[in-house]
Interface confidence: medium
Amino acid sequence: HHHHHHASQPCPYPMAPPNGHLSPVQAKYILKDSFSIFCEPGYELLQGHLPLKSFAAVCQKDGSWDQPMPSCSIVDCGPPDDLPSGRVEYITGPEVTTYKAVIQYSCEETFYTMKVNDGKYVCEADGFWTSSKGERSPPVCEPVCGLSARTTGGRIYGGQKAKPGDFPWQVLILGGSTAAGALLYDNWVLTAAHAIYEQKHDASSLDIRLGALKRLSPHYTQAWAEAVFIHEGYTHDAGFDNDIALIKLNNKVVINSNITPICLPRKEAESFMRTDDIGTASGWGLTQRGLLARNLMYVDIPIVDHQKCTAAYEKPPYSGGSVTANMLCAGLESGGKDSCRGDAGGALVFLDNETQRWFVGGIVSWGSMNCGEAGQYGVYTKVINYIPWIKNIISNF
């Protein structure tokens, strides 16, 4: 027998697709020879419209390749994520989202500032928009705190009417008794524990109103509570130590000139809260006329020496030890200016002379039965003592 060895047909010489190369490179490819295609960085293998993890073709007996040549298509990172309270600009070209394209995130001016990075992102070879620091998630637009239309520095007693934008952090809390609070970031409210204690297991019953100047106005931004956090050290009906609470809102609120968070005190804040330094309390509580205020009122009051305040509340009907190190006092020795029933939970704010931003130094807590009484002072929760507690809750929830 003669065995005829038919030399198998060599396969057509493969041509690497644009932006790709083949391996191994041979003079010719015969039966069972194979080659792979690799794409340059920023390009991905596609067969038709389907992405491939890898590609290898085998030369068949009849001189044909077992599969068609793929293409190397430029990586497309797709439309970048929206930035809440910000926007994205295409730098490379309109709607260009392919490899090496550049986009620039920015935050809405005045009321938001960018956290994490400079907002410049590049479409990388792995298909992700990536910042210069290597972050894949978009930046965060954080509300600017402590902005007020006021340039100088119910329990508002002997006060004056607030104007739009004066106290944009002021929050009206309804649902139990009327109380107040102060907006932190764009989804937290700082208030007094005693003001919302009854609602601690029923956050949804709290009706939270922002951006209002009048207590009864229909023009406000409605917010609802998702959760209430009362300080563990607060004991209801046993004094006012640790009279602080946080309310988490179920949605972020839109920041504008009428709704802006208050800043938390920096470590250096105590230098702006010494005896006789002026703080400002605001609220809808009882006024000198004995009515709950219709308009948001405010009063500028000096910080009172802690020992003097402690002594003022050691006489009956108060019990010794009422004023603790977690409290600060403010008011005039002659009386006439104070916070009062209905103002509880509101912020006593101070201007940080270095940053020119307002920060919360105290929370309206308690005081004499007769607001604005001579020789008695308004007592406020000393916020700086609770910064770790506040930050812990906000970062964990």
Partner: antibody, heavy 123, light 107 residues
Framework: QVQLQQSGPQLLRPGASVKISCKAS????????IHWVKQRPGQGLEWIGM????????GLNQKFRDKATLTVDKSSSTAYMHLNSPTSEDSAVYYC????????????????WGQGTSVTVSS | NIVMTQSPKSMSMSVGERVTLSCKAS??????VSWYQQKPEQSPKLLIY???NRYTGVPDRFTGSGSATDFTLTISSVQAEDLADYHC?????????FGAGTKLELK
């Protein structure tokens, strides 16, 4: 004593607008929001809107946005409601009422009501 | 808008009987509910505010109760002068809304 005195009944042709008045006495007019409420014969009450006499801030039920305009005249302690292009659907008794105060606290309820103004729209 | 549903639509009672009127809100309105009495050809009169607070001069046979979505007006011993329509209303959110009313008649 507290009183809200409303203007008399009105018989109108369709499309002829009307202004109802509500004169307040016996209390500080600028301290209370004034509400307007509609009641069709044999039916319930329907809130139209409210106005703060101190600065004329208004809050309107969206349903009445194109129908009612609320104004006040502080000098005469009078609130007004202007009904635009009335139709038979607007035939009703319209009440003004004040937002109440009790023991120094606003009570989020209407504590005094006018006697009502009957508006009949008929061709 | 919050819908306030009153029941029953009407009821016939004898003098001295205890009457319970119901008002249900379509969503939580806290205690921001008022009750008004309206006699024929008269304007409404405030009876109860804040769900349970009796307004000045209102006889103590009228009692309001409830919170969130379920509210009740109770007349402990109905008198002839109590024959009227009773309206509940919420002032928790705008627009303010009222129920369709309950008509109280004498047997």
């Amino acid at each position: 004593q507290v009183q809200l005195q409303q203007s008399g009944p009105q018989l109108l042709r369709p499309g002829a607008s009307v202004k109802i008045s509500c004169k307040a006495s016996g209390f500080s007019f600028t301290n209370h929001w004034i509400h307007w409420v509609k009641q069709r014969p044999g039916q319930g009450l329907e809130w139209i809107g409210m106005i703060d006499p101190s600065d004329s801030e208004t809050g309107l039920n969206q349903k009445f946005r194109d129908k009612a305009t609320l104004t006040v005249d502080k000098s005469s302690s009078t609130a007004y409601m202007h009904l635009n292009s009335p139709t038979s659907e607007d035939s009703a008794v319209y009440y003004c009422a004040r937002l109440g105060i009790h023991d120094g606290y606003y009570i989020y309820a209407m504590d005094f009501w006018g006697q009502g103004t009957s508006v009949t729209v008929s061709s | 808008n919050i819908v306030m549903t009153q029941s029953p639509k009407s009821m016939s009672m004898s003098v001295g009987e205890r009457v319970t009127l119901s008002c249900k809100a379509s969503e939580n309105v806290g205690t921001y509910v008022s009750w008004y009495q309206q006699k024929p050809e008269q304007s409404p009169k405030l009876l109860i505010y804040g769900a349970s607070n009796r307004y000045t001069g209102v006889p103590d046979r009228f009692t309001g109760s409830g919170s969130a979505t379920d509210f009740t007006l109770t007349i402990s011993s109905v008198q002839a002068e109590d024959l009227a329509d009773y309206h509940c209303g919420q002032s928790y959110s705008y627009p303010l809304t009222f129920g369709a009313g309950t008509k109280l008649e004498l047997k």
